[in-house]
């Protein structure tokens, strides 16, 4: 009933709660002396469904048969309309349309941990749209049945709040859930289980790792578990990996030796538990333990390369470079590199520890045979030394690789190709491709990069430390015993026209011709490898096309003579630079008038 219904009643047959698709009869009847004042025939009873008029009748009562009501709640209100007055509300009723509950499906129960409580879940099936009560029953030993009721609107989970104990782990328990509403009831199929079936152990806790004698090969993982745990599975992986290593262990009693860990690696460890070989379920994974394994002495050998630079008639500068060992080879934090330099005939040797650098430069006499050995050291020991005899890497012309080319290969890659040297190609033991940013001043501080290539290869893709719009000086060395030959080329991975032209800084007259001097274009404005310079000139105030002279680019060149200017004529001169992508805008303009005699 919606209100006090003082003036009349609304009755609903067969019930206020009906099955979807059913028909209801709604009757609205006035109580005695509650109609319109003058003539009862003037009583007009109107039935509303929500706010929409669905029926009316003159008299003391109204009957209406209603079909097709939707799922959910529908409100019907009866009103009285008299002449010359507003409609008066008589009474109302709510009708609840729904369905009987479907059989609950997939009833499943679990107890989290030996000390936990039994909780069950199920699938309710389609919504009944009615108040539906669920009762969960658990029957078992001693002829007992526990019951719990759920009065939530959407009930698909209940925790009994009781704990199954392992006194008789094989005892059978049966769970069943029953759904009841005004239109019917339905029970799930029973779910039968034992203690061992439904107890899901708590995840292991207090995980620790110990390395005996600080050695990765003697490692034990420890943890704590609930008392009845029989099985464990361990998973572990380096922190930077996505793939787990998995180990299953039985009766581990909270410890297990791990034999295949890598040194100086941060690992993540997790453990899960189970009570029985084939019954029950695995616990959740434990919280992760992260731990770093101890160092071991480095393995592998350093990749070492060098450069020689002539200083004067008696001295030469040797610059040694080496690459870091990979993490798996370093097997620890590299504390220093040990460099030993030895004169092979005299036996003199000097050793130096280098920290914080992967290069070393020294000056040695030009005479004698020199060798170097470089090794890497961590807290546990040193790698095997890499030994190199210092030689003139480009001395053997017949060993020079031929037809060296360098071509852009996608983003920030350069493909270097070559042909084997003329001298017996089978004599080549390896090729080394070396590259460094081209700096006009020949700066020795510019980082050096190299890679080694097998003797049967005639190409190499260089990608390390390659930047777009930078020109690289690339050398290909062919090494054979204590001899080497080399060829060089300039290359870039990406180029465009230079951003500016050279700046003319001086024009001088020499015997009827002029010498133009310029400043190099800053490296960051060259936008790749320069191919040519152009010098342009034309008579001042002339509209004619300028003349030009194109000069192949050479790193060290920064002046050029021009001998085709007329004396006592004022010329305007400027310069541009070209890469394979095009020509720069022109540099500064200079005026010059040749003073020499006319012919």
């Amino acid at each position: 009933k919606i209100d006090a219904c003082k003036r009349g009643d609304v009755t609903v047959k067969p019930s206020h709660v009906i099955l979807l698709g059913s028909t209801v009869n709604i009757t609205c009847s006035l109580k005695p002396r509650q109609g319109c004042f003058h003539y009862s025939r003037r009583n007009k009873l109107i039935l509303y469904k929500f706010d929409r008029r669905i029926n009316f009748h003159h008299g003391h009562s109204l009957n209406s048969q209603v079909t097709g009501l939707p799922l959910g709640t529908t409100l019907f209100v009866c009103k009285l309309a008299c002449i010359n007055s507003d409609e008066i509300q008589i009474c109302g009723a709510e009708i609840f349309v729904g369905v009987a509950p479907e059989q609950p499906q997939n009833l499943s129960c679990i107890q989290k941990g030996e000390q936990g409580t039994v909780a069950c879940t199920w699938e309710r099936g389609r919504d009944t749209h009615l108040y539906t009560e669920y009762t969960l029953q658990l029957s078992g030993p001693k002829n007992l049945t526990w019951q719990k009721q759920c009065k939530d609107i959407y009930c698909d989970y209940l925790d009994f709040g009781i704990n199954l104990t392992p006194e008789s782990p094989e005892s059978n328990f049966t769970a069943k859930v029953t759904a009841v509403n005004s239109l019917g009831s339905s029970s799930s199929l029973p779910s039968t289980f034992t203690f061992l079936d439904i107890v899901r152990p708590l995840p292991p806790w207090d995980i620790r790792i110990k390395f005996q004698k600080a050695s990765v090969s003697r490692c034990t993982l420890y943890w704590r578990d609930e008392g009845l745990v029989l099985l464990n599975r361990l998973r572990y992986r380096p922190s930077n990996s996505r793939l787990w290593n998995m180990v299953n262990v039985t009766k581990a009693k909270g410890r297990h030796d791990l034999l295949d860990l890598k040194p100086f690696t941060e690992y993540e460890f997790q453990i899960s538990s189970k009570l029985h070989l084939y019954k029950g379920s695995w616990s959740d994974w434990s919280e992760s333990l992260r731990a770093q394994t101890p160092e071991e002495e480095p393995t592998g050998m350093l990749d070492v390369w060098y450069m020689k630079r002539h200083i004067d008639y008696s001295r030469q500068q040797i610059s040694l470079f080496w690459k870091n060992l990979s993490v798996s080879e370093a097997r620890g934090k590299i504390l220093h590199y040990q460099v030993t330099l030895q004169e092979l005939t005299g036996g003199k040797a000097m050793t130096q520890n280098i920290t914080g650098h992967t290069s070393w430069t020294t000056v040695i006499p030009r005479t004698g045979n020199w060798a170097v050995a470089v090794s890497a050291a961590n807290s546990k020991g040193s790698s095997l030394p890499t030994r190199i005899n210092i030689m003139n890497l480009c001395e053997a012309g017949l060993l020079a690789p031929r037809q060296v080319s360098a071509n852009s290969e996608g983003m920030d890659n350069i493909l270097v190709t070559w042909q084997p040297p003329r001298k017996d190609p089978s004599a080549v033991q390896e090729y080394v491709v070396e590259w460094r940013e081209l700096h006009p001043g020949g700066d020795t501080q510019v980082p050096l990069n190299w890679l080694r290539s097998r003797p049967y290869n005639v190409s190499a893709l260089i990608s390390e430390n390659i930047k777009s719009y930078i020109c690289y000086e690339i050398r290909v060395y062919a090494l054979s015993g204590d001899q080497g030959g080399c060829s060089s080329i300039l290359g870039n991975s990406k180029h465009k026209a230079p951003l500016s032209g050279p700046h003319i800084n001086a024009i001088t007259e020499e015997k009827g011709s002029i010498l133009i001097s310029w400043n190099s274009i800053p490296v960051q404005e060259q936008m790749g490898c320069l191919l040519h310079y152009r010098i342009y000139w034309k008579e001042r105030d002339s509209n004619s096309q300028p003349q030009l002279c194109e000069i192949p680019y050479r790193v060290s060149q920064n002046s050029h003579p021009i001998n085709s200017l007329q004396p006592r004529v004022t010329y305007v001169l400027w310069m541009t630079a070209l890469t394979a992508a095009g020509e720069s805008s022109h540099g500064n303009e200079r005026e010059f008038c040749l003073q020499g005699k006319a012919n």
């Epitope: 658990l138 526990w146 719990k148 009721q149 709040g161 009781i162």
Partner: nanobody, 129 residues
């Protein structure tokens, strides 16, 4: 100290119904689990039904399941046992008991007499065939 007084017992024909009540005083009723036991002449005291503190969880012996319903009204400090479809073998003295909360309720908790701290004097239920 909790005092428990049972009422509602009597003689009823087989198939009939009775509703037993147990009124508690002298303690915080809502903090106790409440149980019903019965004892027939010459037999041991037998567990019948119990209801946990919140009232949402109940436990029955299978011989009465579906016929008996235990309920409680914490506002009135009273626990009830509605007994329907009574059988001659249901005849006994019915006792109400109150058990203190335990740290962990197991499947068997509150189904043994020793789980309860306070007991009523009992009320006789007789069933004639």
């Amino acid at each position: 100290q909790v005092q428990l007084v049972e009422s509602g017992g009597g003689l009823v024909q087989a198939g009939g119904s009775l509703k037993l009540s147990c009124a508690a005083s002298g303690g915080t009723f809502s903090s106790y689990a409440m149980g019903w036991f019965r004892q027939a002449p010459g037999k041991e005291r037998e567990f019948v039904a119990a209801i946990m503190r919140s009232g949402g969880t109940t436990v029955y012996v299978n011989s009465v399941k579906g016929r008996f319903t235990v309920s409680r009204d914490n506002a009135k400090n009273t626990v009830y046992l509605q007994m329907n479809s009574l059988k001659p073998e249901d005849a006994a003295v019915y006792y109400c008991a109150a058990g203190r909360p335990v740290s962990r309720t197991s499947y068997y908790t509150y189904t043994y007499p020793h789980d309860y701290d306070y007991w009523g004097q009992g009320t006789q239920v007789s069933v004639s065939s």
